[in-house]
């Protein structure tokens, strides 16, 4: 069974998938469509790297642009380095500026919904 066939079989169960499962899926050429990606748990999507999301979505990655202001895409973009987002060539905006340090302050983030940044 190839990645696409596997994806079709598990598609309806993906809404509650944890980060680890999404990371594993990204290695299987599943080419997840944006409609499915948008239904994923935000907390499961946030830890994914740009490379992992690119692999997970395959050719559908360009659809991130159209959804960049919708969750979970918006929140995921806020967690990525702008330099990494730029490698996709989609014109995605809102990533962490080059030279900034991300502090993983759980309480700060829980309150504000965004990571705490320290300038260069």
């Amino acid at each position: 069974m190839n990645g696409s066939e596997y994806f079709v079989k598990i598609q309806s169960f993906l809404g509650g998938a944890p980060t680890e499962d999404l990371k594993a899926l990204s290695q299987q050429n599943v080419s997840m469509d944006l409609a499915t990606f948008m239904k994923l748990r935000t907390d499961a999507v946030l830890p994914l790297t740009v490379a992992e999301v690119q692999k997970l979505l395959g050719p559908h990655v360009e659809g991130l642009k159209a959804e960049e202001r919708h969750r979970p895409v918006r929140d995921w973009i806020l967690r990525q380095r702008q330099d990494d987002l730029d490698t996709l060539g989609l014109g995605l905006q809102g990533g962490i500026p080059n030279g900034y340090l991300v502090l993983d302050l759980s309480m700060q983030e829980a309150l504000s919904g965004t990571p705490c940044l320290l300038g260069p």
């Epitope: 469509d33 944006l34 409609a35 360009e62 642009k65 159209a66 969750r71």
Partner: antibody, heavy 119, light 108 residues
């Protein structure tokens, strides 16, 4: 056949609110965002915002922020656009338009709803 | 926001003639994020071209689109009477999404 059927024409007084509905049929409702675009008499097209029917997430054009609210009813495959604090400049034809999630173009449009704001 | 300026505003053309409509953006637009719509009198707009040059389903091949950066073009190669309409360009490269002011094409 894919169809978007909108509610009928409305006449409202300045300061009032209007709620326009858009019923979708012939496709998987949650695979497409629904956008709203308006057109004042003799004028061009103006994008108002969109709603993701799957999550209920909305994005609004800042020009309408605070005045526009988009909602959905998945069980009825219907989306709604409510515009409050109406003024004469809001007189226009309001269109719902389907946009596949992950794209930015509108491949199916409703027939339009004429909203007239007049005292 | 990105302002899309179309020219001409109005064009009166004889059948079989070639029509060229330009859409100039105030800032660069990624070509994948530009589309064209056709709106006939008293009708809803209809998708004509997406991603700058891709014809929407059912659109005749006499329509074509091209361009990049800030300059985009819609061409109707051999105008037919049914092409009388107003044409709009549209970008979703930058928020908020915007449309051009429209170009009305009339048949002589």
């Amino acid at each position: 056949e894919v169809q978007l059927v909108q509610s009928g024409a409305e006449v409202k007084k300045p300061g009032a609110s209007v709620k326009v509905s858009c019923k979708a049929s012939g496709y998987t409702f949650t695979d497409y965002n629904m956008d709203w675009v308006r057109q004042a008499p003799g004028q061009g097209l103006e994008w108002m915002g969109d709603i993701n029917p799957s999550t209920g997430g909305t994005i609004y054009n800042q020009k309408f922020s605070g005045r526009v609210t988009m909602t959905e009813d998945k069980s009825a495959s219907t989306v709604y656009m409510e515009l409050s604090s109406l003024r004469s400049e809001d007189t226009a034809v309001y269109y719902c338009a389907r946009r596949r999630i992950g794209t930015g173009y509108f491949d199916v449009w409703g027939q339009g709803t004429t909203v007239t704001v007049s005292s | 926001e990105i302002v899309l300026t179309q020219s001409p505003d109005f064009q009166s053309v004889t059948p079989k003639e070639k029509v060229t409509i330009t859409c100039s953006a105030s800032s660069s637009v990624i070509s994948s994020y530009l589309s064209w719509y056709q709106q006939k009198p008293d009708q809803s707009p209809k998708l004509l071209i997406y991603r700058t040059s891709n014809l929407a389903s059912g659109v005749p091949s006499r329509f074509s689109g091209s361009g990049s950066g800030t300059d985009y073009t819609l061409t109707i190669n051999s105008l037919e009477a049914e092409d009388a309409a107003t044409y709009y360009c549209h970008q979703w490269s930058s928020f908020p999404y915007t449309f051009g002011g429209g170009t009305k094409v009339e048949i002589k």
